[in-house]
């Protein structure tokens, strides 16, 4: 508005906040995760507060073990209730071996892409889950590497029942799954004594990913 | 849809020797492992042992070690159980069962999700 | 070994009626890794709770379990015909898997 007070565009509009995320989850499915529906019951607390649609934040979900299964990709589900009754049919696929590079691999390489339901432009978040260091560790730092390049941010939860059941060190655990979250890890990386603990960071972990959105 | 069937009942004679099986279907057979569970007549549940058929690694109950062996064919989804010289007292019937839950490392854990149909084994 | 010990042996009860089945373990369950199953005659066992609380796919929300250590509970809101059986409780947090005596819910 002119002091004549007469309408005048303005140089630029004012920018609105983006709700858009392309939020890829990463579940470690292997048979040490017990019990399941912790994972579940996580998941359900975790989408719940996501505003998803095709124009909001999309939810994709990758699980892994010994392979690879897409559960649901980016552009299945078009609103919060569709992806929470999905997300609770998710079956635990099992296996004795946790391929977390593989993992996180097939999630950038094919969850990620425009066919599956990535947008251009829109910021990338993968959240991986696991409770046991990789088989596939070798593979660790090229795949972290490559999702770096391709700027997509990641939240990693450490979950250490099977450590804390087996009475074993979490150390070199810690540490890789540390190594797995974007910087700065303190804001990336969280760790749970247990599964059925896993709804106790679903609050921060939340806030942490739509901060990404500022 | 979890299914496990068991093989049909035996009767046998003490000192014969008897495999019995169990297929699984409708999930990854070779990613859980199975267990086995024998119910003596009019007695209660006892767990024998259990295999992960993905590389048959087996661990028994103390109860039940060098009394039975467990083996699988993954190729086939089967999971067996098996005596070389049967007793009296292994009459019985015999489950088996879906384990939610791992055995891996020193420390097993879990619950039975899929239980077969049973096998009645009667030795007179 | 973890030996669980069930009380009582037989419950005598009506349909409609609630029951308290007890379990007792000899030494704390870590985790309350505890299950509980149903047995109907000539029938497998079937699965209705696990780690002390959780119900298993498809149980009628009558069914609740409770208890933590050494002491837990089957609790059947209000039985209904069906659920006359015998009940088991396993526990599995010691590398072993034990199962209790069992608890006969009959019909009074």
């Known amino acids: 508005v002119s002091p004549t007070f007469q309408v005048v565009n303005s140089f630029a509009p004012v920018q609105e906040c983006s709700t858009q995320l392309d939020i890829v989850i990463v579940l470690d499915g292997s048979n040490s995760i017990y019990p399941w529906d912790s994972v579940t019951a996580f998941l359900n607390d975790l989408l719940e507060r996501m505003d998803i649609g095709p124009k909001q934040t999309q939810v994709g979900i990758v699980q892994y073990g010994e392979n690879v299964t897409h559960e649901f990709n980016l552009n299945k589900y078009s609103s919060t209730e569709e992806v929470l009754v999905a997300a609770k049919k998710i079956v635990q696929r099992g296996g004795r071996q946790t391929m977390t590079a593989l993992g996180i691999d097939t999630a950038r390489k094919e969850a990620f892409t425009e066919a599956r339901g990535a947008r251009r432009g829109v910021k990338k978040v993968m959240v991986i889950v696991t409770d046991g260091e990789s088989h596939d560790n070798h593979r660790l730092k090229k795949v972290i590497q490559d999702c770096e390049d391709e700027n997509i941010q990641r939240f990693s939860i450490a979950i250490l029942g099977s450590y804390n059941r087996g009475n074993l060190s979490t150390e070199k655990f810690v540490e890789e799954i540390k190594s797995i979250a974007s910087e700065p890890t303190e804001k990336h990386f969280f760790n749970v004594s247990d599964e059925l603990a896993l709804v106790t960071i679903v609050k921060t972990l939340g806030e942490r990913i739509f901060a990404l959105e500022a | 849809e979890v299914q496990l069937v068991q093989s049909g009942a035996e009767v046998k004679k003490p000192g014969e020797s008897l495999r019995i099986s169990c297929k699984g279907s409708?999930?990854?057979?070779?990613?859980?492992?199975i267990g086995w569970v024998r119910q003596m007549p009019g007695k209660g549940l006892e767990w024998m042992g259990i295999?992960?058929?993905?590389?048959?690694?087996?661990r028994y109950s103390p109860s039940f070690q060098g009394q039975v062996t467990i083996s699988a064919d993954k190729s086939i989804s089967t999971a067996y159980l098996q005596w070389s010289s049967l007793k009296a007292s292994d009459t019985a019937m015999y489950y088996c069962a879906r384990l939610q839950g791992d055995c891996s490392g020193g420390t097993c854990y879990g619950h039975f999700d899929y239980w077969g149909q049973g096998t009645l084994v009667t030795v007179s | 070994e973890i030996v669980l010990t069930q009380s009582p042996g037989t419950l005598s009860l009506s349909p409609g009626e609630r029951a308290t089945l007890s379990c007792r373990a000899s030494?704390?369950?870590?985790?309350?890794?505890l299950a509980w199953y149903q047995q109907k005659p000539a029938q497998a066992p079937r699965l209705l709770i696990y780690v002390a609380s959780r119900r298993a796919t498809g149980i009628p929300d009558r069914f609740s379990g409770s208890g933590s250590g050494t002491d837990f509970t089957l609790t059947i809101s209000r039985l209904e015909p069906e659920d006359f059986a015998v009940y088991y409780c396993q526990q599995y947090g010691t590398s072993s898997w034990t199962f209790g005596q069992g608890t006969t819910v009959e019909i009074k």
């Open positions: 030494q704390s369950v870590s985790s309350s890794y």
């Open positions: 409708g999930y990854s057979v070779t990613s859980y492992w």
């Open positions: 295999i992960y058929p993905g590389d048959s690694d087996t």
